[in-house]
Amino acid sequence: PEPPTACREKQYLINSQCCSLCQPGQKLVSDCTEFTETECLPCGESEFLDTWNRETHCHQHKYCDPNLGLRVQQKGTSETDTICTCEEGWHCTSEACESCVLHRSCSPGFGVKQIATGVSDTICEPCPVGFFSNVSSAFEKCHPWTSCETKDLVVQQAGTNKTDVVCGPQDRLRA
């Protein structure tokens, strides 16, 4: 028969022959022959391959270096890599999460729109009119100004995006 020029899914072409790829979690030891199936071997401890492959070496699991603020979020298997995340109060600098930086805080006049996670930084937003933030924080949202009216008080000093209003007693009208 004519030697193949293309192979089925999960196969590869070598020396005019279609050989089965090794399944995830296994590496190639020896190509198939007309008489013998592809020889594959499971990846060792701390190694993985996550696709059907013809790799002769498994990949090393990622190391979550505590010196870089990293910790293991999900332990790797023979078919998956280790997933790293950052220690509390830190977040990854990239999608690959190779190092961590401290969450940023929102300055006075800004509040937290979205609290940081292990993979994303704090998202701040300016406090709109009627709201303020007088602290630098990675957790505090903008607070609404105090409503003097509900306390039967009057505004003595207008609020800003960084300060609350100051309420005071109403002036009594003399008869």
Epitope: N15, S30, D31, T33, E34, F35, T36, E37, E39
Partner: antibody, heavy 117, light 109 residues
């Protein structure tokens, strides 16, 4: 450990038959092609026959074609060589060997076949 | 049929010396499918080199293979006492038959 052990050799008269066996252990026998290779006393290696892992493909050396039959029983992890119409020139040590794309990587210790009247 | 011719037939050397064994094919052989075997008296052959130049598992690095096309070489850089044996080349690219060379005997001088 990975091992091949041949048996069934002996002294036989010309024209008679003999069946050799090769018992495999320590590996997935049903995934590998298997060969028979022989060596006449004081001579070199001569390839005899090969069978594919599931038994569908078989090839023979011209010197044994039509007289020898290679077969396998994967449920018993055993390879066979049925030798009919034996001749004096078939006298040899018969080895079974495992097929890979790297050559014959595992060999048995051999079994001696002597064809003599 | 590819015929493999090995030379010399016998090589007489002393331990520590370098051995160079030749295997010539009657037509071009894919180097992916050229192997070398070692055989000691009363023992089965042992795979030494496959793919013309790759050492099999557990084979010491004093053994090396080279060559392509029709000319292949097995080199033993420094002969150890246990290396005195018969060496066979084999092609398994073009079959049937899978052919062996006639062998080279490496003997102690």
């Amino acid at each position: 450990q990975v091992q091949l052990v041949e048996s069934g050799g002996g002294v036989v008269q010309p024209g008679r038959s003999l069946r050799l066996s090769c018992a495999a252990s320590g590996f997935t026998f049903s995934s590998y092609g298997m060969h028979w290779v022989r060596q006449a006393p004081g001579k070199g290696l001569e390839w005899v026959a090969v069978i594919s892992y599931e038994g569908s493909n078989k090839y023979y050396a011209d010197s044994v074609k039509g007289r020898f039959t290679i077969s396998r029983d994967n449920s018993k992890n055993t390879l066979y060589l049925q030798m009919n119409s034996l001749r004096a020139e078939d006298t040899a040590v018969y080895y079974c060997a495992r097929d890979t794309s790297r050559g014959h990587d595992i060999w048995g210790q051999g079994t001696m076949v002597t064809v003599s009247s | 049929e590819i015929v493999l011719t090995q030379s010399p037939g016998t090589l007489s050397l002393s331990p520590g010396e370098r051995a160079t064994l030749s295997c010539r094919a009657s037509q071009s052989v894919s180097s992916s499918y050229l192997a070398w075997y070692q055989q000691k008296p009363g023992q089965a052959p042992r795979l030494l080199i496959y793919g013309a130049s790759s050492r099999a598992t557990g084979i010491p690095d004093r053994f090396s293979g080279s060559g392509s096309g029709t000319d292949f070489t097995l080199t033993i850089s420094r002969l150890e006492p246990e290396d005195f044996a018969v060496y066979y080349c084999q092609q398994y690219a073009d079959y049937p038959p899978f052919t062996f060379g006639g062998g080279t005997k490496v003997e102690i001088k």
